[in-house]
């Protein structure tokens, strides 16, 4: 499996091939409005997505993508 | 060229109010949470406020709660810090700064100096 | 008194490693990332080190930040006298709702 592994403040991308045991490849996009934004990008052996985990707008919102294909992870979905 | 321009220090009575002005360009500036920090002479960095990119945000160190409103205009590309009743104690090199990444500033103005005296 | 706490000063021979520390607790470095700054004299700040350990565009790999716990660490290896300047360490305090630094250290190059 090929993902894109980076951290950027907004999208970013650079493809690597994974470890054997990384089935899925993650995104986690993390937006707090006093605090910046951050976009982790990685190989992960497991992967749950979530996609609004905070209640208050205060507190930021933070989402976790997950898929299973060649650089599937090199767009960013709101 | 991404830069942050500040403007309005000078020297000012305890009491007295100052406006504090920066000039953002180079980049897409209703899309990032600003900032002020601030060193005074002698003294480390001090946050002194920020504001989310739509203004929805907006925090203040509690050293200056209550006396210094930070405000910005998108349409003018620009960030402002009204300060009230000021102190000696807020004698300083004032910086605006953007932040990208997360809890990180990845762009500093050169500074404005404010004395109070 | 600076919120996250960092030795005054350190120095270091050209070419030597230095390390500098910055010690927080538990609402700030101990939930948060850290970031590093470079202070050159006359100038404003340069971010370094982000999200504890990673280099920001355009920095020189002699940098390098690590953090466990409650601290960080700051290390530049192979120091060059260009290198001169305070550093300065932060983090988000989720107490203060907002972010601290520490009170910098000027590293001198022998």
């Known amino acids: 499996l090929r993902c894109h592994v980076c951290t950027s403040s907004s999208n970013c991308k650079h493809s690597v091939v994974c470890p054997a045991s990384s089935r899925f490849c993650k995104t986690t996009n993390t937006v707090e409005p006093l605090r910046g934004n951050l976009v982790k990008k990685d190989c992960a052996e497991s992967c749950t997505p979530s996609y609004t985990l905070q209640g208050q707008v205060s507190s930021g919102t933070s989402s976790t993508q997950c898929c299973q294909e060649d650089l599937c992870n090199e767009k960013l979905h709101n | 060229e991404v830069q942050l321009v500040e403007s309005g220090g000078g020297l000012v009575q305890p009491g007295r109010s100052l406006r504090l002005s920066c000039a953002a360009s180079?980049?897409?500036?209703?899309?990032?949470?600003m900032h002020w920090v601030r060193q005074a002479p002698g003294k480390g960095l001090e946050w002194v406020s920020g504001i989310s990119w739509n203004s929805g945000s907006i925090g203040y160190a509690d050293s200056v709660k209550g006396r210094f409103t930070i405000s910005r205009d998108n349409a003018k590309n620009s960030l402002y810090l009204q300060m009230n009743s000021l102190r000696a104690e807020d004698t300083a090199l004032y910086y605006c700064?953007?932040?990208?990444?997360?809890?990180?500033?990845?762009?500093w103005g050169q500074g404005t100096t404010v004395t109070v005296s | 008194q600076s919120v996250l706490t960092q030795p005054p000063s350190v120095s270091g021979a050209p070419r030597q490693t230095v390390t500098i520390s910055c010690s927080g607790s538990?609402?700030?470095?101990?939930?948060?990332?850290v970031t590093w700054y470079q202070r050159l004299p006359g100038e404003a700040p340069k971010l370094l080190i982000y999200y504890d350990d990673l280099l920001h565009s355009g920095v020189s790999d002699r940098f390098s930040g690590s953090k466990s716990g409650t601290s960080a660490s700051l290390a530049i290896s192979g120091l060059q006298s260009e290198d001169e300047a305070e550093y300065y360490c932060?983090?988000?305090?989720?107490?203060?709702?907002?972010?601290?630094f520490g009170g910098g250290t000027k590293l001198t190059v022998l």
């Open positions: 932060a983090s988000w305090d989720d107490s203060l709702k907002g972010p601290v």
């Open positions: 538990s609402s700030n470095i101990g939930q948060n990332s």
């Open positions: 180079g980049f897409t500036f209703d899309d990032y949470a």
């Open positions: 700064a953007k932040t990208g990444i997360l809890d990180a500033f990845d762009i």
